[in-house]
Amino acid sequence: ESLGTEQRVVGRAAEVPGPEPGQQEQLVFGSGDAVELSCPPPGGGPMGPTVWVKDGTGLVPSERVLVGPQRLQVLNASHEDSGAYSCRQRLTQRVLCHFSVRVTDAPSSGDDEDGEDEAEDTGVDTGAPYWTRPERMDKKLLAVPAANTVRFRCPAAGNPTPSISWLKNGREFRGEHRIGGIKLRHQQWSLVMESVVPSDRGNYTCVVENKFGSIRQTYTLDVLERSPHRPILQAGLPANQTAVLGSDVEFHCKVYSDAQPHIQWLKHVEVNGSKVGPDGTPYVTVLKTAGANTTDKELEVLSLHNVTFEDAGEYTCLAGNSIGFSHHSAWLVVLPAEEELVEADEAGSVYAG
């Protein structure tokens, strides 16, 4: 049974529907949960071959990672499964759906299910309700950033099968009590709230009862308002490089940002023999600009082909959002073709604005 138009329970797991292209859905899951992401074809039409990517790297199917054309399932999720997931068209690499996934400790928040807590006939003749997974109910306080999806679970059993109801701050809690509604999944003993806001803060109590008794559990939800910040660049990227004349070089820059980042690759240049302008700021020229309407990973790569001695020098990855810019720089050394390639061992210099 479910509330409203919720019809996303498939098999033993409930899928997270894909956001509109260009939007990023932010999801929080509990450790041990099954993460299931769904990316239906835009407009319902054919999608063609797709590939699932995590943090820029294609996902390899395994016993734990189940990859389908429109769905990705990661079983028994752990902290290492946190990251940026996207479904792309294989040929064009166009991003069809992208998700920001964070895996935290139980009780779990996120619109996923692993199906292990479905109501079933326990074989007990008669009995009051009891918790079937008390170890998954240890975390009584859940703090999540605004806009995330939260799920509270109270997996229980009893005979006859108990009913479950929910209270907020001690009062009956129904879908009309919050913008965006709620999803009650009685089969999974769960309450789901999507895109939480500060007004969702409070105490949530599940009440599980049958004619032989009643049990309850209270969770406290704190919704953290995002403190916006400029983009964060991964340490050590871009890295210094040494290349042989005529070879190809790639600089990489990994950008993390709440607000959509805008990436520029800069090359430091000299003007009239000077490296800096009258106010002391370094002279640069823009080599590549990545737009705000795309998230393709190639924008985080600067490729230099058939390098010449003029290509040697300092390069900067500049990532900006509405808050400001962050910068990391690296050097390229170009050696004559007959000299052996020598690895640059110094880390790239860092600027932050």
Epitope: V276, G277, D279, V286, F325
Partner: antibody
């Protein structure tokens, strides 16, 4: 969201000076360059110069050298453009415009203007 | 400062495609991929439509596209609509901003 709100219309006599303000909001004022562009009635866009709100450095178009001064007040996220020795041909709409380029660098090539103020009409008439 | 050269006017019927050219030199348009295009409706501030020759900011219709060949950059508007009627300016950045003279687009 990014907003650039300019001061109201001005009427000035030839030889006088005018100072137009541009208050920025929705982003970190000191992180982005601010450019000034003007447009005479029925004419095209004419670039006047830029100010780096972080360093205070400026770069003026040759045509306006000696007559234009660009300043900023970082405490109120506001840029100013002052034009002196006004003449009738200075009658125009003056725009402040945010340039997509980090104020930590001096852009030789590349970059672009991504947001514009609503414009301030300056009329020079005797 | 030498302006970039644009046609004074172009026109097209609804649904058609039109192209506006912007000619510079090898030291601006031709030498670098740094051409932006702005749309300006009467009495309004300009709006960024294309940057770095062919990149579209988010929120701009994909009917607008940019390209470059030699020293000439082009803005193409496909599926022309009445609201596309406006002035269009190209711009190149090198040390200072250089704008084109502007092109008045009339939708017949």
């Amino acid at each position: 969201q990014v907003q650039l709100v300019q001061s109201g219309a001005e009427v000035k006599k030839p030889g006088a000076s005018v100072k137009v303000s541009c208050k920025a909001s929705g982003y970190t004022f000191t992180s982005y360059y601010m450019h000034w562009v003007r447009q005479a009635p029925g004419q095209g866009l004419e670039w006047m110069g830029w100010i780096n709100p972080n360093s205070g450095g400026t770069n003026y178009a040759q045509k306006f050298q000696g007559r234009v001064t660009m300043t900023r007040d970082t405490s109120i996220s506001t840029a100013y453009m002052e034009l002196s020795s006004l003449r009738s041909e200075d009658t125009a709409v003056y725009y402040c415009a945010r340039y997509y380029g980090s104020s930590l660098y001096h852009y030789v090539f590349g970059g672009f203007i991504d947001y514009w103020g609503q414009g301030t009409l300056v009329t020079v008439s005797s | 400062d030498i302006a970039l050269t644009q046609p004074a006017s172009v026109s097209g019927s609804p649904g058609q495609s039109i192209t506006i050219s912007c000619t510079g030199t090898s030291s601006d348009v031709g030498g670098y991929n740094y051409v932006s295009w702005y749309q300006q409706h009467p009495g309004k501030a300009p709006k960024l439509m294309i940057y770095d020759v062919s990149n579209r900011p988010s929120g701009v219709s994909n009917r607008f596209s940019g390209s470059k060949s030699g020293n000439t950059a082009s803005l193409t508007i496909s599926g022309l609509q009445a609201e596309d009627e406006a002035d269009y300016y190209c711009q190149s950045h090198h040390f200072y901003e250089v704008f084109g003279g502007g092109t008045k687009l009339t939708v017949l």
